[in-house]
């Protein structure tokens, strides 16, 4: 007779790992016990549990409660076991040993390996400002048995650097990705995968990019310098920019107050029925938490008595 | 002829603890499971322990589990019973007996000693 | 325990059946004590097996999970207490003995 088992068992942390063992003996031949010992290198042999052909199982206290036989029907020449819920201290070599009649005793081994899937975790760099040159976005870190694979999935120009930490059982990889932040990569997605055959799928964290930054201002409405005539009604200036965060915007006049009747909403400035007394230089002032911009305008409101117009200077400073 | 010799018994203290020894002879001793059985004054036969051929595999009645501890010596042919927490039921004729096979069954007794007698009291 | 009579009795010549059950495993033996205090004495072990010093008049047979001592032509020699063993999960066992009168 000879006995059939496996080189190697894998099984996923948490999940039941059958070591199978058996005895393909000619007819007549009867198995008395079949023992099952943990074998690693350098140790000596750790008795798991015994299948006895009268006795029926034992487990040695080690194993309590985690050692059981394969559910009915049983051959009686198949001493396979189960071992429950297994863990990564579980992973090594295996003895199965048979005793037949009369055939004698007959061994073999076989390697557990416990695939141990890892708990991907993403984070964040520091604030990405534009302007800055090249920037940690995100470090993603994954352990697992064995190594994990750790890539990124991204729209987004940049570079990544890996870095793998072994400890006894098991592996950390780290992986880094840099770039140099510019406004276009606001709100795109920063995607760490990580592969490994413990997963039934990869596992992917997704990361939205906020790059912080302020536009030039600019102010429009003054487009067309001959509306703005005594009398016109809805005269407005609005002041434009962009930025991360959103920015607030502030406007003041700089050769004296706002005029009277004058509304301020946001960006927006809103003038009553024009009068020579809006004429002047009005200055819109935009910040967020990574800067601010001014733009100012000069208005000058035309008397249609007058012949002449007048010019108008547009001035941006930052 | 098998024979088991068994030693160790008297009177001892409550609370302490005793060591009884069998040596074995007349048969292959490594090949055969071993046992304690015992008998209180007046009671039936009660399984104490037993022990497997290769000694990696021991079983205990439950009225000595946790306080007792069965081993075999191959090169001794012997067994022994270290039964510690001493209390007054233990006290009886400790018989040690042979497996006709690798376990310790009792349906598998084909052999026994003359047995030892212990008794707990102060 | 395994569970056995307390007693049986038969006059000399007759044939006296003990039965035992129980335990977790189908095999037992049956043991023979004369007078408490004396060794045991195999009669029957691995449910069928008789040592060889052991007259024939012992035999044992199994039906179904009860199992039989069958002592055929009682002798006065015979009286005893007659302890059936056997497993239970983890450990070995035994019944609490049944006491055979010979009238």
């Known amino acids: 007779g000879e006995l059939e088992t496996s080189d190697v068992v894998t099984v996923v942390l948490g999940q039941d790992a059958k070591l199978p063992c058996f005895y393909r003996g000619d007819s007549g031949e009867q198995v008395g016990q079949v023992a099952w010992a943990r074998v690693d290198a350098g140790e000596g042999a750790q008795e798991l549990a015994l299948l006895h052909s009268k006795y029926g199982l034992h487990v040695s206290p080690a194993y309590e409660g985690r050692v059981e036989q394969p559910p009915p029907p049983r051959n009686p020449l198949d001493g396979s076991v189960l071992l429950r819920n297994a863990v990564q201290a579980d992973e090594g070599e295996y003895e199965c040993r048979v005793s037949t009649f009369p055939a004698g005793s007959f061994q073999a081994r076989l390697r557990l390996r416990v695939l141990v899937p890892p708990l991907p975790s993403l984070n964040p760099g520091p604030a990405l400002e534009e302007g800055q040159g090249l920037t940690l976005a995100a470090s993603c870190t994954a352990e697992g048995s064995p190594a994990p694979s750790v890539t990124w999935d991204t729209e987004v120009k940049g570079t990544t650097s890996s870095r793998s930490f072994k400890h006894s059982r098991s592996a950390a990889v780290t992986s880094e990705f840099h770039l140099v932040p510019s406004r276009s990569m606001n709100g795109q997605p920063l995607t760490c995968v990580v592969s490994h055959p413990g997963l039934l799928q990869d596992q992917r964290i997704t990361h939205i990019l906020h790059v912080s930054f302020l536009a030039e201002a600019s102010v429009r409405g003054l487009e067309d310098q001959n509306l703005w005539h005594i009398g016109r009604e809805g005269a407005m200036l609005k002041c434009l920019s962009e930025g991360q965060p959103p920015p607030s915007y502030n406007w003041t006049r700089l050769d004296g107050p706002l005029p009277s009747g004058v509304r301020v909403d946001g960006d927006t400035l809103g003038f009553p029925p024009l009068t020579t007394e809006h004429s002047g230089i009005y200055v819109c002032h935009v910040s967020n938490e990574f800067s601010s911009r001014d733009s100012q305008v000069t208005v000058d409101v035309l008397d249609p008595q007058e012949d002449s117009g007048k010019q108008v200077d547009l001035v941006s400073a930052s | 002829a098998v024979t088991l010799d068994e030693s160790g018994g008297g009177l001892q203290a409550p609370g302490g603890g005793l060591s009884l020894v069998c040596r074995a002879s007349?048969?292959?001793?490594?090949?055969?499971?071993m046992f304690w059985v015992r008998q209180a004054p007046g009671k039936g036969l009660e399984f104490v322990a037993g022990?497997?051929?290769?000694?990696?595999?021991?079983g205990y009645g439950a009225a000595v589990k946790g306080r007792a501890t069965i081993s075999r010596d191959s090169g001794q042919s012997t067994v022994r019973l270290q039964l510690n927490n001493l209390r007054a039921e233990d006290t009886g004729i400790y018989y040690c007996?042979?497996?006709?096979?690798?376990?310790?069954?009792?349906?598998?007794?084909?052999?026994w000693g003359h047995g030892t007698e212990v008794i707990v009291s102060s | 325990a395994l569970t056995q009579p307390s007693s049986v009795s038969a006059n000399p010549g007759e044939t006296v059946k003990i039965t035992c059950s129980g335990g977790?495993?189908?095999?037992y033996g049956w043991y023979q004590q004369k007078s408490p205090g004396s060794a045991p004495v195999t009669l029957i072990?691995?449910?069928?097996k008789r040592p060889s010093d052991i007259p024939s008049r012992f035999s044992a047979s199994k039906s179904g999970s009860t199992h039989t001592l069958t002592i055929t032509g009682v002798r006065a020699e015979d009286e005893a207490v007659y302890f059936c063993?056997?497993?239970?999960?983890?450990?070995?066992?035994f019944g609490a003995g049944t006491t055979l009168t010979v009238l």
């Open positions: 007996a042979k497996s006709a096979g690798d376990w310790y069954g009792a349906d598998d007794i084909d052999a």
């Open positions: 007349g048969f292959t001793f490594s090949s055969h499971g």
């Open positions: 022990i497997s051929d290769a000694g990696s595999w021991t």
């Open positions: 977790s495993s189908n095999y």
């Open positions: 072990y691995n449910n069928n």
């Open positions: 063993g056997g497993w239970d999960k983890s450990a070995g066992i």
